[in-house]
C-alpha cells in the first residue's frame, strides 16, 4: 500500500486556447484530471487501474500552482494504491477548461480539453521527487512526482506491513525495510519474548517482562539458581528441588538427627577426649585428675591412696607428697626399715618375716589392706561399675550409681529402651547398645515413625515432555519442572506462537 504523489508546479497556455484551437472566453479556467494506470508500452484506453484524481480550477491560462492549493484542492495530488508497487506506471494528465463551477465531464463544452499528456516509465519507491516538463504546440506543463509507502508499509514495493506495537502481540518499532526492531528488553521473531534479568537461570527461571526473574517451582534466589530443600529440612542442603542432603554429622529424613554430638555440643570438660557413640550419645575419656561422665569432677591425687604403710598424703600443685611413718621411706613409703619385732602390722594383721628378717609381710584380716594392713579396703578401686557407672563407698559395702539406660548391681544390665513402645504407627523397635531404632511401616518415617510420608508421587511418571518430577513429601504431591517451551501442571502444553500477524 502506498501513494503516488503528483505535484503540479506550472502550467503555461499563453494564448489561452483549447486543444481545438478555439480561444477560451474570457480565459481558460483550468483544472486537471489525472489517470494513473499500470505500465503500457503504448498508453491504452481503459480503466485507470492505479487511480484517478481531479483538481478544482487552479488558475486561468498560465499560472504557477502553489503547494496545498486553496479551494479544496491538494497539491501534491494523492493517488493511493493498495497493492505492491510494480515499479512501472503510465500517467495521463489532462488540462480542461471549466466555464462554470460544474466540473463533471458531461457539464463541460464538447471541446473543453486544453491539453493531454501521457508518460510511461519506471519509478522506484522513495522520497525524492522526479521533475518533468511536457510541451505541446500551445501549452507547457511542469510537474514532479514520486511514490511513497503508506503508513505502516515498508520495502521497495511498499508490500511489507509493519505496525509498531508495544503489547501482548509484540514490542517493536519498524526499520526502513519493514523488518522489526525489538524494543529494549525484548527478543524473538515478533519481539514477544522478554529478556530476563541478566544471569537468570535458563531452565529454572523465567520472566513475563524484561529484567525480571521469576522462579519455577522448587527454585529460589535472585537468579533462581538456588534449589528449595525439602520442607522441614533442618541441617541439610539440596542440589535439585525438594532434596534434603544432610550436612556432616546429621542424619534422618529432615537432617535433624544429631550424629556428631561431640562436635556440635563439646560435652567433655577439662580437656577430655570425646567419642561419638550413637545418636545424641557420647563417651568422655578423662585426663588424669578428672572424673565424672563429662570429666567435670576434679580428682584429688590423694584420693587413690598412693602412700603405703600408713603414710599420709598431701596434695600439691604438681602432684602429691607422702609423709611416711617411722620405719618407712620412699616416694610411696614403700620401703621399710622395720621387722616383725617392731609389730608393724595394724588392725590385727599377722607379721611374717622374709629374707632372713630383713623385711616382713603383713597378712591382713578382711576389710583391711596395705603393706601394714593400715588401710580399710576401698571397694571402688577395682572399678566394679560397668557402663560408666559411678562407684560409691557405703561403709562396709559399696554401690554403683548407673548412667541412664543401665541397671543392676554393677550397672551391667541394659534397660530395654523398647519397653515403653516408643515407635509410633506400628513401627518395630530394636534395642541398640546406645539407644533404640524404629523400623517404620510404608507411609511413615522419622526416628519414631511419627512422620506420615506418601508413596513416591513421582513413581507414576506424571510429567510430560521430559520434565523433571519432584515429590513434595510434606503434601503428598508432585511438582513438574518444565523444560523451556512447555507449560502446565504436568508440562503438557507447548508454548505456541501466533501463526501469523494477529492484527
Amino acid at each position: 500500500s502506498g501513494v503516488f504523489q503528483l505535484q503540479l508546479q506550472e502550467f503555461i497556455n499563453e494564448r489561452g486556447v483549447l486543444a481545438s484551437g478555439r480561444p477560451c472566453e474570457p480565459g481558460c479556467r483550468t483544472f486537471f484530471r489525472v489517470c494513473l494506470k499500470h505500465f503500457q508500452a503504448v498508453v491504452s484506453p481503459g480503466p485507470c487501474t492505479f487511480g484517478t484524481v481531479s483538481t478544482p480550477v487552479l488558475g486561468t491560462n498560465s499560472f504557477a500552482v502553489r503547494d496545498d492549493s486553496s479551494g479544496g484542492g491538494r497539491n501534491p495530488l494523492q493517488l493511493p494504491f493498495n497493492f505492491t508497487w510494480p515499479g512501472t506506471f503510465s500517467l495521463i494528465i489532462e488540462a480542461w477548461h471549466a466555464p462554470g463551477d460544474d466540473l463533471r465531464p458531461e457539464a463541460l463544452p464538447p471541446d473543453a480539453l486544453i491539453s493531454k499528456i501521457a508518460i510511461q516509465g519506471s519509478l522506484a519507491v522513495g522520497q525524492n521527487w522526479l521533475l518533468d516538463e511536457q510541451t505541446s504546440t500551445l501549452t507547457r506543463l511542469r510537474y514532479s512526482y514520486r511514490v511513497i509507502c503508506s503508513d505502516n508499509y515498508y520495502g521497495d514495493n511498499c508490500s511489507r506491513l509493519c505496525k509498531k506495537r508495544n503489547d501482548h502481540f509484540g514490542h517493536y518499532v519498524c526499520q526502513p525495510d519493514g523488518n522489526l526492531s525489538c524494543l529494549p528488553g525484548w527478543t524473538g521473531e515478533y519481539c514477544q519474548q522478554p529478556i530476563c534479568l541478566s544471569g537468570c537461570h535458563e531452565q529454572n527461571g523465567y520472566c513475563s517482562k524484561p529484567a525480571e526473574c521469576l522462579c519455577r517451582p522448587g527454585w529460589q534466589g535472585r537468579l533462581c539458581n538456588e534449589c528449595i530443600p525439602h520442607n522441614g529440612c533442618r541441617h541439610g542442603t539440596c542440589s535439585t528441588p525438594w532434596q534434603c542432603t544432610c550436612d556432616e554429622g546429621w542424619g534422618g529424613l529432615f537432617c535433624d538427627q544429631d550424629l556428631n554430638y561431640c562436635t556440635h555440643h563439646s560435652p567433655c570438660k577439662n580437656g577430655a577426649t570425646c567419642s561419638n557413640s550413637g545418636q545424641r550419645s557420647y563417651t568422655c575419656t578423662c585426663r588424669p585428675g578428672y572424673t565424672g561422665v563429662d570429666c567435670e569432677l576434679e580428682l584429688s591425687e590423694c584420693d587413690s591412696n598412693p602412700c603405703r604403710n600408713g603414710g599420709s598424703c598431701k596434695d600439691q600443685e604438681d602432684g602429691y607428697h607422702c609423709l611416711c611413718p617411722p620405719g618407712y621411706y620412699g616416694l610411696h613409703c614403700e620401703h621399710s626399715t622395720l621387722s616383725c619385732a617392731d609389730s608393724p602390722c595394724f588392725n590385727g594383721g599377722s607379721c611374717r618375716e622374709r629374707n632372713q628378717g630383713a623385711n616382713y609381710a603383713c597378712e591382713c584380716p578382711p576389710n583391711f589392706t596395705g603393706s601394714n594392713c593400715e588401710k580399710k579396703v576401698d571397694r571402688c578401686t577395682s572399678n566394679p561399675c560397668a557402663n560408666g557407672g559411678q562407684c560409691l563407698n557405703r561403709g562396709p559395702s559399696r554401690m554403683c550409681r548407673c548412667r541412664p539406660g543401665f541397671t543392676g548391681t554393677y550397672c551391667e544390665l541394659h534397660v530395654s529402651d523398647c519397653a515403653r513402645n516408643p515407635c509410633a504407627h506400628g513401627g518395630t523397635c530394636h534395642d541398640l547398645e546406645n539407644g533404640l531404632m524404629c523400623t517404620c511401616p510404608a507411609g511413615f518415617s522419622g526416628r519414631r515413625c511419627e512422620v506420615r510420608t506418601s508413596i513416591d508421587a513421582c513413581a507414576s511418571s506424571p510429567c510430560f515432555n521430559r520434565a523433571t518430577c519432584y515429590t513434595d513429601l510434606s503434601t503428598d504431591t508432585f511438582v513438574c519442572n518444565c523444560p523451556y517451551g512447555f507449560v502446565g501442571s504436568r508440562c503438557e502444553f507447548p508454548v505456541g506462537l501466533p501463526p501469523s500477524f494477529p492484527w
Epitope: L18, A19, S20, C35, K37, H38, V42, V43, S44, P45, G46, P47, C48, T49, F50, T52, F83, I92, E94, P110, D111, A112, L113, S115, K116, I117, A118
Partner: antibody, heavy 119, light 111 residues
Framework: QVQLVQSGAEVKKPGASVKISCKAS????????IHWVKQAPGQGLEWIGY????????NYNQKFKGRVTFTTDTSTSTAYMELRSLRSDDTAVYYC????????????WGQGTLVTVSS | DIVMTQSPDSLAVSLGERATISCRAS??????????MKWFQQKPGQPPKLLIY???NQGSGVPDRFSGSGSGTDFTLTISSLQAEDVAVYYC?????????FGGGTKVEIK
Amino acid sequence: QVQLVQSGAEVKKPGASVKISCKASGYSFTAYYIHWVKQAPGQGLEWIGYIAGYKDATNYNQKFKGRVTFTTDTSTSTAYMELRSLRSDDTAVYYCARDYDYDVGMDYWGQGTLVTVSS
Amino acid sequence: DIVMTQSPDSLAVSLGERATISCRASESVDNYGISFMKWFQQKPGQPPKLLIYAASNQGSGVPDRFSGSGSGTDFTLTISSLQAEDVAVYYCQQSKEVPWTFGGGTKVEIK
C-alpha cells in the same frame, strides 16, 4: 451530442488500397482514442487497433500490421484508417468507435463503412 | 492471444423470462482488481452498443434488466426479464491484452 460519422461504402479491386474516414463531433476529440473494428458478412467482431486523438500513439492487431495505418487530423477531429493490399476476405463493414482512459469502453460507434473487394 | 468463448451460440427465451449468456476467457482478464471485460449488443444493420464495462458496470442509458457478473476467466451477462427489443446478438470482449478480442457472439431470440 456525441457523433461519429463514417465515409460511404467502397468497392475495390484486390491489391488496391482504401482509406475510410471517421469524423467526430460533440466531444473533445483529442481526449479520446479511436478504435477500428471489422465485421465480415454474417460474422462476429474483430478488433483492428486504435489511435490516440492527442498524439500519434497507435496499437495494431498483428494480424493487420503492415497493411493498415491509422491517422488523425485534430483540426477537423477526423480519424482515418487506410487498408492496403486488399484481398477478398477484407470484404466487411468497418466501424470506428471512441474510447477513453476512464474505462467506459467503446461507448459511441460510427454507422459503419462497407468495403467490398471484388475483381 | 486471449480466446473468448461464448455459450450458447443461440438462445430462445420467452418474453419476461431470464436469459443468461456465459463467456469464458482462455486466461484471466483481471488486472489490479479490475476485470477488463465488456458486453455489447448488436441489432441487425446497426453498430454494436456498449451494455456493460468492467464486468459489472452498466453503460450510459442501459436498462437495469441488463447485468454483468464474474471475474478472472468466467463471466455472465443476464437479462432479468427479456423484452422484444432485446432480440440481438450479444458479444463479450476483453481489453486486458492486445489484441483486444471478442467472443463469437450469442443470438438471443423470443421463444
